[in-house]
Interface confidence: low
C-alpha cells in the first residue's frame, strides 16, 4: 500500500475542525507580478512581504510595489506601503534583514536616471517605522551588515567604490575606490580586492587583497596577484596567480591575512576553479575543478590549519564556476554530507559521508522501494537524491533536500531508486537516522517543510493544476492526513515557515486567477491544536546517533565521540514547543589511526590505516610553503582529524622526519606587506 494508507495509521482526532479554526486567509490587493517574503527576527512573528508588478511601456518599464507586514506569523497582513512613501523597491536587492534579533531592515528603492545617488528605507524596529535616506552613490550590491555590529553596513557602488556606514545607513563614507569584492570578516574587519589598471575583469589575477580593521581609517595590503578570495569558518583563502604561467594556487591564512601558507592542493588553470563547499572553525571542504570542460572535480578535506588536504571524493559533480553542485550539509546529524558524482558512463550517482568526508558510500536502498530501469540488477541498487543539479536541469523536482539542526536525524529529499539518478518523476524519501536508512514517504514530487522541531511534517503535491489540499504527518512521515484548506483551489507558488523549524505555522502562497484579474493569496495554518499538549519526559526516547551495529562496543563513534539524543517518539502527538532544545549526551571514544589524517608528505595505502611517506617525495625539497618563509617542517606523519575529540587509545608515534621545503609561491611574505593610513 502507499505510504500512509496502511492499517497501522491512526487518524489524528478531529483534526479538520481544529485546523479549520486555525486557518487564516489573506487576499492581497495586488496584480500578480512577483512576491518576496522575509522573516524579521527570530520568534517575533514579523513577516515582510514585498509584491512588485512591472508594466512594460513602449519606452520604459513602469514599476509598482507594495509592502505588507504581519506580526502574527502571517495570519494577518497590513499594507504599510505608505511607510516607504509608495516608492518602488528594487527586488534584485531584496530586503536586507539585520543579523540576530536586531530588528533592522533596509529596502533599496528604484530612483530616476538623473539622480545623484540611490535611496534606501531603514527600519530598526522590526519594520514598524521606516526612515528614508538618500545615498551619495548608486548601490551595486545589497547592503551588508557586519555580523558583530548591525549598525555597521558596507556596500559597493556602481562605480566600484567601497562605502561604509557606522550608523545604520544614516551617513556614508567612501573608504576606497576601484574595489571588486568586499566581505565582512570577524571583529568588524573588512577584506576587499582592488584593481590598479583597467577594471576588475581586466585585472583578474593581478588584484590586490586589502584589509581594514577600523572601518577605513587604516589599511593593510595582505596579498598581491590575487584572482579571488573567500572566507570560510576561521579560514581566509586567496587564489593567487603563479609567477611563470597562468595557473593559480590556493593560499590560506588563519590570522586574518597577516601570514599565509600555501594549501597543499593542485594548482588550477584559467578555465578551472576552486570552490569552498563547506567550512567551519575546524576544517574546510574544497572542490578543485578538473582540467577541461568535464563538469566534475575532486573534493579535498583540510586539516585544522587549512593547509594539508586529503582527497575525499573523485569525480564530484560541479558543472562550472558558479554552476551547480549537489553538495549538501545534512544539518540534522553531525558529520553527514550528501553530494553527486559523475560516473564514467556520464550517469549521476548520489554519495553520502557520515564522517565529514572520510569515506563516501552509496545510499542504502529503501526497503519499501524497487529498483528502477537504471538498475542492472533488480535486487541491488541505491537511492539517488535530486538536488540543485536536477532542479537546474528542469527535472520534476520542486525542492532540494531538507534537514534542520533541531529535527535530529530527519532528512527529506526527492529521489529515485536505481543505479543512478533517473529522469523519471521522483518520489519523496525520508531518513530518520541522518541518512543511514531511507523510506519512501510520498508518491510523486512534493513541497515539504518541517514544523515544531520535527513534530510535524507538512507537504503539498507539486502540480500544474490549482490545489486546495495540504498533507501533514505527526510521526516523521509514516502516516499522512489530508486537509482541504480552501474550497477554491489556488495556483500554488510556495510554502513558507519561519526559519529554524520551531514554528507551528505554515503559510501556503499562491494566486487566484479569474477572467479579469489574478491576485496573491496566502493561507496560514496553525497546527497548535493538532499537537494539543506539551511533550513530557515519557514522550522522548534515547537514540544513539550513527548507530550501525549495537553489538559493537564503539557503535556510534564518529570523529572521536558518540552522542545520545533524546528524540520524540513517533507515536507521541505533542508539542516540542518553541523553546525546545535538543538534548544530547556526548561520550568520548578511544583514538584509533582512523582518527588521524596523514600529514603532508605522507599517504595511506589502500586498505591500510597507517600513514607512510610518499615515495616520490623522499629526499626531495617539498613544495610546501608555511607562512611564506623557508623553514624546516617536522611531522610524525599524522595529524588529528579536525574536530575529532577522541582520547587515549592509539597515539601514533613516528620517527620525526625533517622535511626541508622550498617556497615556490611569490605570494606576499609578511616582511613584504605594507600598511597605510587614511
Amino acid at each position: 500500500s502507499a505510504p500512509g494508507e496502511d492499517e497501522e495509521c491512526g487518524r489524528v482526532r478531529d483534526f479538520v475542525a481544529k485546523l479549520a479554526n486555525n486557518t487564516h486567509q489573506h487576499v492581497f490587493d495586488d496584480l500578480r507580478g512577483s512576491v518576496s517574503l522575509s522573516w524579521v527576527g527570530d520568534s517575533t512573528g514579523v513577516i515582510l512581504v514585498l509584491t512588485t508588478f512591472h508594466v512594460p511601456l513602449v519606452i520604459m518599464t513602469f514599476g509598482q510595489s507594495k509592502l505588507y507586514r504581519s506580526e502574527d506569523y502571517g495570519k494577518n497582513f497590513k499594507d504599510i506601503t505608505d511607510l516607504i512613501n509608495n516608492t518602488f523597491i528594487r527586488t534584485e536587492f531584496g530586503m536586507a534583514i539585520g543579523p540576530e534579533n536586531s530588528g533592522k531592515v533596509v529596502l533599496t528603492a528604484e530612483v530616476s536616471g538623473g539622480s545623484r545617488g540611490g535611496r534606501i528605507f531603514r527600519s530598526s524596529d522590526f519594520a514598524k517605522n521606516f526612515v528614508q535616506t538618500d545615498l551619495p552613490f548608486h548601490p551595486l550590491t545589497q547592503m551588508m551588515y557586519s555580523p558583530q555590529n548591525s549598525d555597521y553596513l558596507l556596500a559597493l557602488s556602481t562605480e566600484n567604490g567601497l562605502w561604509v556606514s557606522k550608523n545604520f545607513g544614516g551617513k556614508w563614507e567612501e573608504i576606497h575606490k576601484a574595489v571588486c569584492l568586499a566581505k565582512w570578516g570577524s571583529d568588524n574587519t573588512i577584506f576587499f580586492t582592488t584593481y590598479a589598471n583597467g577594471s576588475c575583469k581586466a585585472d583578474l589575477g593581478a588584484l590586490e587583497l586589502w584589509r581594514t580593521s577600523d572601518l577605513g581609517k587604516s589599511f593593510k595590503t595582505i596579498g598581491v596577484k590575487i584572482y579571488s578570495f573567500g572566507l570560510g569558518g576561521r579560514f581566509l583563502f586567496a587564489s593567487v596567480m603563479a609567477d611563470k604561467d597562468t595557473t593559480r594556487r590556493i593560499h590560506v591564512s588563519t590570522d586574518q591575512g597577516d601570514t599565509w601558507s600555501m594549501a597543499q592542493l593542485p594548482s588550477v588553470g584559467q578555465e578551472q576553479f576552486y570552490s569552498i563547499l563547506a567550512a567551519n572553525d575546524d576544517m574546510v571542504f574544497m572542490h578543485v575543478d578538473e582540467p577541461g570542460d568535464t563538469g566534475f572535480g575532486t573534493i579535498f578535506t583540510s586539516d585544522d590549519r587549512g593547509i594539508v588536504y586529503s582527497k575525499s571524493l573523485d569525480r564530484h559533480l560541479y558543472t562550472t564556476t558558479g554552476g551547480e553542485t549537489d553538495f549538501t550539509n545534512v544539518t540534522s546529524l553531525r558529520g553527514v554530507y550528501i553530494t553527486s558524482v559523475l560516473s564514467e558512463d556520464n550517469s549521476i550517482q548520489t554519495m553520502i559521508t557520515f564522517d565529514q568526508g572520510g569515506r563516501w558510500t552509496h545510499l542504502r536502498k529503501p526497503e519499501n522501494s524497487e529498483c528502477d530501469a537504471t538498475a542492472k540488477n533488480k535486487n541491488e541498487c541505491s537511492l539517488h537524491i535530486h538536488a540543485s543539479y536536477s532542479i537546474s536541469q528542469k527535472l520534476n523536482v520542486p525542492m532540494a533536500p531538507l534537514s534542520e539542526p533541531n529535527a535530529v536525524g530527519i532528512v527529506i529529499a526527492h529521489g529515485s531508486v536505481g543505479d543512478a539518478i533517473s529522469v523519471m518523476v521522483p518520489d519523496v524519501y525520508i531518513s530518520d537516522d541522518g541518512g543511514y536508512s531511507w523510506t519512501k514517504m510520498l508518491e510523486g514530487p512534493h513541497y515539504y517543510t518541517i514544523l515544531d522541531s520535527g513534530g510535524i511534517i507538512v507537504a503539498i503535491e507539486h502540480s500544474s493544476r490549482p490545489i486546495n489540499v495540504i498533507k501533514f504527518s505527526t510521526d516523521e512521515g509514516q502516516c499522512w492526513q489530508t486537509y482541504t484548506f480552501t474550497r477554491d483551489p489556488i495556483y500554488f507558488t510556495g510554502l513558507a515557515s519561519e526559519p529554524g523549524a520551531r514554528s507551528m505555522n505554515i503559510s501556503i502562497w499562491g494566486f487566484t486567477e479569474s477572467f479579469l484579474t489574478s491576485q496573491w493569496v496566502s493561507y496560514t495554518i496553525d497546527f497548535k491544536d493538532i499537537l494539543e499538549r506539551n511533550c513530557e519526559e515519557k514522550d522522548y526516547t534515547i537514540w544513539l546517533a550513527h548507530s550501525t551495529d549495537p553489538e559493537d562496543y564503539e557503535d556510534g563513534c564518529i570523529l572521536g565521540y558518540k552522542e545520545q539524543f533524546l528524540r520524540l517518539r513517533k507515536s507521541s502527538v505533542c508539542q516540542n514547543g518553541r523553546d525546545y532544545v535538543v538534548t544530547k549526551q556526548p561520550s568520548i571514544c578511544l583514538c584509533s589511526l582512523e582518527d588521524f589524517l596523514c600529514d603532508f608528505g605522507y599517504y595511506r595505502p589502500e586498505n591500510d590505516s597507517k600513514c607512510v611517506e610518499q615515495p616520490e617525495l623522499k629526499g626531495h625539497d617539498l613544495e610546501f610553503c608555511l607562512y611564506g618563509r623557508e623553514e624546516h617542517l617536522t611531522t610524525n606523519g599524522y595529524r588529528k582529524i579536525p574536530g575529532d575529540k577522541c582520547q587515549g587509545g592509539v597515539n601514533p608515534v613516528r620517527e620525526v622526519k625533517d622535511l626541508k621545503k622550498k617556497c615556490t609561491s611569490n605570494f606576499l611574505s609578511p616582511e613584504k606587506q605594507n600598511s597605510k593610513s587614511n
Epitope: D549, C589, L590, S592, L593, E606, N607, G649
Partner: antibody, heavy 129, light 107 residues
C-alpha cells in the same frame, strides 16, 4: 611493567552471581579498552564483552547480554566483570585482557587491529551445587 | 556474528620443520585479525596483530599473512617451546570471535 592482576578463584552455586576484578598497572588505565574472555575446561576461547574506561561504555556478546555487567573504577584502575544466574556451563577460567585497538569494530575496512596484548593470569570460577 | 574456522584441528610437526596454520572467516574481516599462542595452564599470548604484524618480543620465525577471509600463521622452523595451541581472532565486527584453535604437537 604492564600487568593485569585478577582476583582469586571462586566456587559458586547455580543461580548465584560472581564478580571478578582486574587491576591494571604499569600504563595509563584510560588509554586502553578492556575485554573479558573465558575458557571452559578443554575448550577454546570465548569473548564476553568489552568496556571503554573513558565513560564506562560497554558492549557485550549477545550470548551474555542480560547476565553480564562490566564496570570500572578509574580511581583504582580496576575493571570488574559480574556474571549472574550462574549455571554449571559457566565453569571456566575468566581472563581480563587489555585491548588497545581503539577502533570501531563496525568501522571501515582500513581500520587497524592491535590484538589483546596483555592478559591477566585468569580467575577460575567453578559453578557446582 | 562472524564465524572463524581454523584448520587443521591438530598439526603434528617435527622440531625444525615449517608449520602452516589456516584461519578462515565467514565474511571479510579485512586485516582486523590477531593470532594467539596458549600453553597448558597459561593465559594466551599475542603473537600477530593486524593480520601480519608481529607483537613486541615475538621471534621472527612467526609470520602472519592474508586479508579478507583467508589467513595463515607460519612458523618457519619449529622450536620446542612452540608446541602449543594457536587461536585466531577477528575484530572486524562485534562480537569479537575466536577460531576453535589448532594444536601443534611434536611428531
Amino acid at each position: 611493567q604492564v600487568q593485569l592482576v585478577q582476583s582469586g578463584a571462586e566456587v559458586k552455586k547455580p543461580g548465584a552471581s560472581v564478580k571478578v576484578s582486574c587491576k591494571a598497572s604499569g600504563y595509563t588505565f584510560t588509554k586502553y579498552y578492556m575485554s573479558w574472555v573465558r575458557q571452559a575446561p578443554g575448550q577454546g576461547l570465548e569473548w564476553m564483552g568489552i568496556i571503554n574506561p573513558i565513560g564506562g561504555s560497554t558492549s557485550y556478546a549477545q550470548k551474555f547480554r542480560g547476565r553480564v555487567t562490566m564496570t570500572r573504577d578509574t580511581s583504582t584502575s580496576t575493571v570488574y566483570m559480574e556474571l549472574s544466574s550462574l549455571r554449571s556451563e559457566d565453569t571456566a577460567v575468566y581472563y581480563c585482557t587489555r585491548d588497545p585497538s581503539g577502533i570501531a569494530a563496525a568501522g571501515p575496512a582500513s581500520r587497524y587491529y592491535y590484538g589483546m596484548d596483555v592478559w591477566g593470569q585468569g580467575t577460575t570460577v567453578t559453578v557446582s551445587s | 556474528e562472524i564465524v572463524m574456522t581454523q584448520s587443521p584441528a591438530t598439526l603434528s610437526v617435527s622440531p625444525g620443520e615449517r608449520a602452516t596454520l589456516s584461519c578462515r572467516a565467514s565474511q571479510s574481516v579485512s586485516s582486523n585479525l590477531a593470532w594467539y599462542q596458549q600453553k597448558p595452564g597459561q593465559a594466551p599470548r599475542l603473537l600477530i596483530y593486524g593480520a601480519s604484524t608481529r607483537a613486541t618480543g615475538i621471534p621472527a620465525r612467526f609470520s602472519g599473512s592474508g586479508s579478507g577471509t583467508e589467513f595463515t600463521l607460519t612458523i618457519s622452523s619449529l622450536q620446542s617451546e612452540d608446541f602449543a595451541v594457536y587461536y585466531c581472532q577477528q575484530a572486524r565486527l562485534g562480537p569479537w570471535t575466536f577460531g576453535g584453535g589448532t594444536k601443534v604437537e611434536i611428531k
